[in-house]
Interface confidence: low
Amino acid sequence: GWVWNQFFVPEEMNTTSHHIGQLRSDLDNGNNSFQYKLLGAGAGSTFIIDERTGDIYAIQKLDREERSLYILRAQVIDIATGRAVEPESEFVIKVSDINDNEPKFLDEPYEAIVPEMSPEGTLVIQVTASDADDPSSGNNARLLYSLLQGQPYFSVEPTTGVIRISSKMDRELQDEYWVIIQAKDMIGQPGALSGTTSVLIKLSDVNDNKPIFKESLYRLTVSESAPTGTSIGTIMAYDNDIGENAEMDYSIEEDDSQTFDIITNHETQEGIVILKKKVDFEHQNHYGIRAKVKNHHVPEQLMKYHTEASTTFIKIQVEDVDEP
């Protein structure tokens, strides 16, 4: 019968002919009376056989990622009679893996949006690298993920590529972060290959800033002839948040005379001081009122950022008009 062991050839071997193993008949007594032949795809071009001994060699560099096994046929003939000594037999040559492929991130570019001030542990995005090497061959395709850029704000789970928040971030300080993730095969051991990807993480706004008046004192004037409903000036607060988180409402906090009102222009986010009652220079020629400003929408969990509304003082001078 036929005698052989399992045949393996490492991929990417640079030797001009790499000995793989030996095929022989147990009837072969070593006196060179038998002839061995190799048939099938790759016979003669990729693999050759020593016709006298049955030793098989690879004569080309092989790439396991291109082709991982070859199915060949063997024959053995008695040279004297030309007859087959053994029935033709099929055998397999497996191409064994070496770590010659770096991990690749196939779904680039990565981009994620996460609310600012999200707590530690919040999931941001999962990145996944692929390694063309053999997952069943040692650690050649076993990947570990690590963070090259993004500390101390982000962390990556080493085995899953899940990116999480590791420290609170404030959009008003920085609204986007570039995180660089490395995937390393061989579970980080010597000889490991690596690939990197960039993840753009954008912070969405939460209402963690209250509006604050630009000035602590505004000076306005009103003519005593002004009718009620007259706009006598504007006041303005600023809010570091954006969008609806920066929408604000102005109101009167203190006006003993109940002469003025403030309405909010929701397009410009200005407060418009309105005359509610007519004024009389001869009766009172100046007024002092206090205004406050608050955000329009404040979720309950963000109320701690909105204690004590910002206030401002408005001094209003009444202008005299000649009366008949």
Partner: antibody
Framework: QVQLVQSGAEVKKPGASVKVSCKAS????????MSWVRQAPGQGLEWMGI????????TYAQKFQGRVTMTGDTSTSTVYMELSSLRSEDTAVYYC?????????????WGQGTLVTVSS | QSVLTQPPSASGTPGQRVTISCSGS????????VNWYQQLPGTAPKLLIY???QRPSGVPDRFSGSKSGTSASLAISGLQSEDEADYYC???????????FGGGTKLTVLS
Amino acid sequence: QVQLVQSGAEVKKPGASVKVSCKASRYTFTSYYMSWVRQAPGQGLEWMGIIHPSGGDTTYAQKFQGRVTMTGDTSTSTVYMELSSLRSEDTAVYYCARGGIKLWLHFDYWGQGTLVTVSS
Amino acid sequence: QSVLTQPPSASGTPGQRVTISCSGSRSNIGSNFVNWYQQLPGTAPKLLIYTNNQRPSGVPDRFSGSKSGTSASLAISGLQSEDEADYYCAVYDDSLNGWVFGGGTKLTVLS
């Protein structure tokens, strides 16, 4: 280089109040929180409270609620810490420390400290 | 009793590596930056490590910080006599809505 210069040492009787000042320079005063931290003789650091000079927002440690008042004067870039109903255990060095632009960011610069002695 | 727990003392000889731990909870170390301060005798505290592991300019790279879960640690390698000081960890606490300090660790450099 940021500078925080505190007022001089004080000796007070039990029951009195003390007001310590901290003058800031070489940075935008209204952008950063300011904390007050005290250290009793031979003891560790104890956070008292924090103020944002721009809006006057304050947060006080539970222990000092009702006894401490922190204020800021933007015209002179100075913050003040007033502690009332003093008792002997309030004898300590009081430090002002500049925080970040958020409540939860580190204190990067400290004043030289003001020794307050409470003794009858 | 401090919210953050530090060993009261630590020691080492010149050239040695010393580690100081700081243990807290989810509401402080678990969800905020850890900072370390060095206080030399008779002086104001000085920021040594901020945002868990960053060093301000002028702080030697012998000092390093790390954080894992609800604990943090300060490591000092190549210990020098001038490192003899008190070391405090500090962190913002979300539950208390305020800052908390560790009780402090007195580091002695043995000659």
